[in-house]
Interface confidence: low
């Protein structure tokens, strides 16, 4: 691929590219892409591989340029890079490109999988780990158990999965999980299929998600006491302001991280 001539990295090191409020947002959110150069620059360019490019220019005599994407649509998602240049570099000469920033604009995140490690059948006295695996890193994961209104556990994970440990004696039951962006504006995933954990000798069974009537879906945070959590089968009701789950009354048998947990 032919690109504008790029000098050695030591001459014009790459800038940093970040997104506010987040790199994963719902459609309609205003997103600001910030390109920060390690030295004052004259022109910044925002690039999207293969697009009619540069996508946007900013002429600013400073280290920072902001590119405003108003009321983003899914089509504006994708990979972005930025470069900077100075007038004394000569025509067509740009800095090294920034690392890739991937902007995801979506109503909901892909459904995670929920699996038991080492398996869904628990022996006497053995603990079991449930792994909720999505596709994105740096997400907050939430585990539910059928018949328990409040979420059982929260985990913030740098990996695209989180492991939840269940004590063997209390492990059997029906579970589901989901994940969401760790900060506002929150984007929630679809919830996983349910997973049945059973005692040795009983045999596990898989059930479609809609047949878990006792489980509760993510509801509004405690700051909205008048609102009711929707049922699990209507996981993403239209019109509800989507918020991630915040710790509420915890089930006594399997405590969740306290509210100070950074993943909450």
């Amino acid at each position: 691929d032919i690109t504008p001539s790029v000098p050695p990295a030591s001459y014009h090191p790459k800038p940093w590219l970040g997104a506010q409020p987040a790199t994963v947002v719902t459609p309609g959110v205003n997103v600001t892409l910030r390109c920060r150069a390690p030295q004052p620059a004259w022109r910044f360019g925002l690039f999207k591989p293969g697009e009619i490019a540069p996508l946007l220019f900013r002429d600013v005599s400073s280290e920072l340029a902001e590119f405003f994407l108003e009321e983003v649509t899914p089509a504006q998602g994708g990979i972005y890079r930025c470069c900077y240049r100075r007038p004394d570099w000569g025509p067509g000469v740009w800095s090294q490109p920034s690392d890739v920033l991937e902007l995801l604009v979506t109503e909901e995140l892909p459904r995670p999988s929920l699996v038991a490690l080492p398996g869904p059948v628990v022996g006497p006295g053995a603990n079991v780990s449930l792994r909720c695996a999505g596709r994105l890193r740096n997400m907050s994961f939430v585990l539910y158990r059928e018949g328990v209104a409040a979420p059982l556990q929260y985990r913030h994970s740098a990996q695209p999965w989180a492991d939840f440990t269940l004590l063997g004696a209390r492990a059997p039951g029906t579970y589901s999980c989901y994940y969401h962006t760790p900060s506002a504006p929150y984007v929630l995933s679809q919830r996983s299929e349910v997973l049945v954990i059973s005692w040795e000798g009983e045999g596990p069974e898989a059930r479609p998600a809609s047949s878990a009537p006792g489980m509760q879906a993510p509801g509004p945070p405690p700051s909205d006491p008048g609102a009711q959590a929707p049922s699990l089968s209507s996981f993403r009701p239209r019109g509800l302001v989507l918020q991630p789950l915040l710790p509420q009354t915890q089930d006594s048998w399997d405590p969740a991280p306290p509210p100070s947990d950074p993943g909450v």
């Epitope: 691929d1 032919i2 690109t3 504008p4 360019g45 690039f47 999207k48 591989p49 293969g50 697009e51 009619i52 490019a53 540069p54 220019f57 089509a75 504006q76 998602g77 994708g78 990979i79 470069c83 025509p91 067509g92 740009w94």
Partner: antibody
Framework: EVQLLESGGGLVQPGGSLRLSCAAS????????WTWVRQAPGKGLEWVSG???????NYAQNFQGRFTISRDNSKNTLYLQMNSLRAEDTAVYYC????????????WGQGTLVTVSS | QSVLTQPPSASGTPGQRVTISCSGS????????VSWYQQLPGTAPKLLIY???NRPSGVPNRFSGSKSGTSASLAISGLRSEDEADYYC?????????FGGGTKLTVL
Amino acid sequence: EVQLLESGGGLVQPGGSLRLSCAASGFTFSDYYWTWVRQAPGKGLEWVSGSPVFGAANYAQNFQGRFTISRDNSKNTLYLQMNSLRAEDTAVYYCAKAGFTGGHFDIWGQGTLVTVSS
Amino acid sequence: QSVLTQPPSASGTPGQRVTISCSGSSSNIGNNYVSWYQQLPGTAPKLLIYGNSNRPSGVPNRFSGSKSGTSASLAISGLRSEDEADYYCQSYDSSSWLFGGGTKLTVL
């Protein structure tokens, strides 16, 4: 080696349809903006349509509604579906790949001739 | 009628310097890159200049591009017989790619 190979051209009657293909090899097809450019006999280059990596395809005004560009990243292939063809659509049709940051077409196919005549 | 305007023809003798102009507006050339293509008879266009003044590898430094305001130009120095071809400028606006009408260069 980087290569683009167009096919699907030929003789078609006015009002007819034709589908052109452009098979790419030698680089990651899905990473780039792809485009069709045409050249009528003895005339200059005319941009027809483009297929971005993300988002909706774009078209020159003359072709909106009659022509449809599409891509199959799994097959490394770009397509141009041409409907309601007219005599003035007679041209060599080239597919081309856009460069990363320069707003230019760095790789071109050899072209395929479309003749619209009764 | 092309949005980018080029002279239909240009000529020069071997060794001479020839310049081809391309005129546009603030919505295309004024705010965006200009590229130049060479099309030899019976062949596909070939990228000659991109980003106003950059040469792809393999293009001789006899070819140079420049841009000023809403106009651009392609200069060919040390003209050779193999430079006889059609030359097209190209830029873009917010939604389309634009080509000049082309300039037929004759080496006398």
